[in-house]
Amino acid sequence: SERCDDWGLDTMRQIQVFEDEPARIKCPLFEHFLKFNYSTAHSAGLTLIWYWTRQDRDLEEPINFRLPENRISKEKDVLWFRPTLLNDTGNYTCMLRNTTYCSKVAFPLEVVQKDSCFNSPMKLPVHKLYIEYGIQRITCPNVDGYFPSSVKPTITWYMGCYKIQNFNNVIPEGMNLSFLIALISNNGNYTCVVTYPENGRTFHLTRTLTVKVVGSPKNAVPPVIHSPNDHVVYEKEPGEELLIPCTVYFSFLMDSRNEVWWTIDGKKPDDITIDVTINESISHSRTEDETRTQILSIKKVTSEDLKRSYVCHARSAKGEVAKAAKVKQKVPAPRYTVELACGFGAT
């Protein structure tokens, strides 16, 4: 056979679908690899061919589109399962070709099982809600294209094993789940089950997402430097180890980049010759506020080092702050034996 542009196995599209549920999978060629869509390709006389490799097999085989009740079918650039079976797991290839052109891509499809509380190996999308922010909604994801707008599905929402009913602050509203006022107790996994009829059969779509309640922008503040501060003086003798922590609190801000850095005499530590190391640790509160600590360390400090300016800087989308550490050389303690002796007139 003639050469074919092979885009290989597109592992970025690790598609997971639930066993015994409908699944519609678009050929990735038109979404990620080619500059034209299926309609254009079809008009130009190109044909879309599907085949697959079963899990733990090397042999590519055609997809059987003659199964009872059209369990697997193709419609335009979509491969349909009505419904999936566990042994549909494998690598699927869609190939677009005519006599002069060929392009193909493979992608993994994993059919996963769920238990009665919707636990499964499925990777879950995370939806962040602001704490105590007023009404916020999540929407049952990835159900478009499964049934026509004339069909009115029934939607049931669950939190874990439990149907969402009579909850204090969570109200199911069809495809949406409304949080009247999101609290930490609303953290968790929420599942919508969409039930719809098709050709005398009933199908279910199960979609689970994780809700994480995070700090509200109403309460967000610029970075707060807790250390260094005016109450602590780093007093050292030459030869001792100098350790200065820079501890900064960042309010949660969606898509904000939190940064902490030290300057020594106005320069980044990498740009100066002294032997300095910086270790960073990060911790998060339950609402994803962040505390970053960068410890500046000089193993054997010199008297010149103790005259330098050590400034901790922090920046987020809310602003930039800086604070200098109070560093000084320890004054040697008086040597009492000599000085007291001198005081008593000894020679």
């Epitope: 009665s116 874990g160 439990y162 969402i164 009579n166 909850f167 953290n187 968790g188």
Partner: antibody, heavy 122, light 107 residues
Framework: QVQLVQSGAEVKKPGSSVKVSCKAS????????IQWVRQAPGQGLEWMGY????????DYAQKFQGRVTITADESTSTAYMELSSLRSEDTAVYYC???????????????WGQGTLVTVSS | EIVMTQSPATLSVSPGERATLSCRAS??????LAWYQQKPGQAPRLLIY???TRATGIPARFSGSGSGTEFTLTISSLQSEDFAVYYC?????????FGQGTKVEIK
């Protein structure tokens, strides 16, 4: 170690109500459900309903709808089951039970209270 | 609602022998089945969930099997403390329902 401690035995007249309490110790940080199950003398187990104290969600078995009310007081980690319009066939041991989380399939009855005997007699 | 039927109602077994208890669901419950043990005057205790997974602290002589509508609890070698009533429970569909119980007594 999580424990459920229930209120003491009750003797009630037909037509009256009973309210049984179930106090949890060592509650986990994440939401959980309290289930109520009853067992008539020499009979099997019968699920009555549940409540999720931190979220307020509840549901009742069809058989008990209109007669049972399950509530919870989060501040005292106590759940309550009230059954009204009592009749002699409501004579049973009433149990509360719970799991560690809302997500553990098959483990929603991990921990049980010691049971409360309710006798309905004229 | 799903009806759970246990058999036999009573099982007479000698200590050290194997006991096999059955539970049938009126419709498929997949593997969403639990087994409980209840001794006189005590609350039930979770033994098995997910049809075959032993709960924490349950001895290995207890094992569960089955899926769909037919389930079995096996006690490989009965100890004196195993004589009790055993209940199965499905949690595939609401309302969660229990079987009527099997009493395992000393032969």
């Amino acid at each position: 170690q999580v424990q459920l401690v229930q209120s003491g035995a009750e003797v009630k007249k037909p037509g009256s109500s009973v309210k049984v309490s179930c106090k949890a110790s060592g509650s986990p940080a994440e939401p959980y459900a309290i289930q109520w199950v009853r067992q008539a003398p020499g009979q099997g187990l019968e699920w009555m309903g549940y409540i999720i104290p931190s979220l307020g969600g509840y549901d009742y078995a069809q058989k008990f709808q209109g007669r049972v009310t399950i509530t919870a007081d989060e501040s005292t980690s106590t759940a309550y089951m009230e059954l009204s319009s009592l009749r002699s066939e409501d004579t049973a041991v009433y149990y509360c039970a719970r799991g560690q989380t809302l997500y553990a399939a098959g483990r929603q009855f991990d921990i049980w209270g010691q049971g409360t005997l309710v006798t309905v007699s004229s | 609602e799903i009806v759970m039927t246990q058999s036999p109602a009573t099982l007479s077994v000698s200590p050290g022998e194997r006991a096999t208890l059955s539970c049938r669901a009126s419709q498929s419950v997949s593997s969403n089945l639990a087994w409980y043990q209840q001794k006189p005057g005590q609350a039930p205790r979770l033994l098995i969930y997910g049809a075959s997974t032993r709960a924490t602290g349950i001895p290995a002589r207890f094992s569960g099997s089955g899926s769909g509508t037919e389930f079995t609890l096996t006690i490989s070698s009965l100890q004196s403390e195993d004589f009790a009533v055993y209940y199965c429970q499905q949690y595939n569909n609401w309302p969660w329902t229990f079987g009527q119980g099997t009493k395992v007594e000393i032969k």
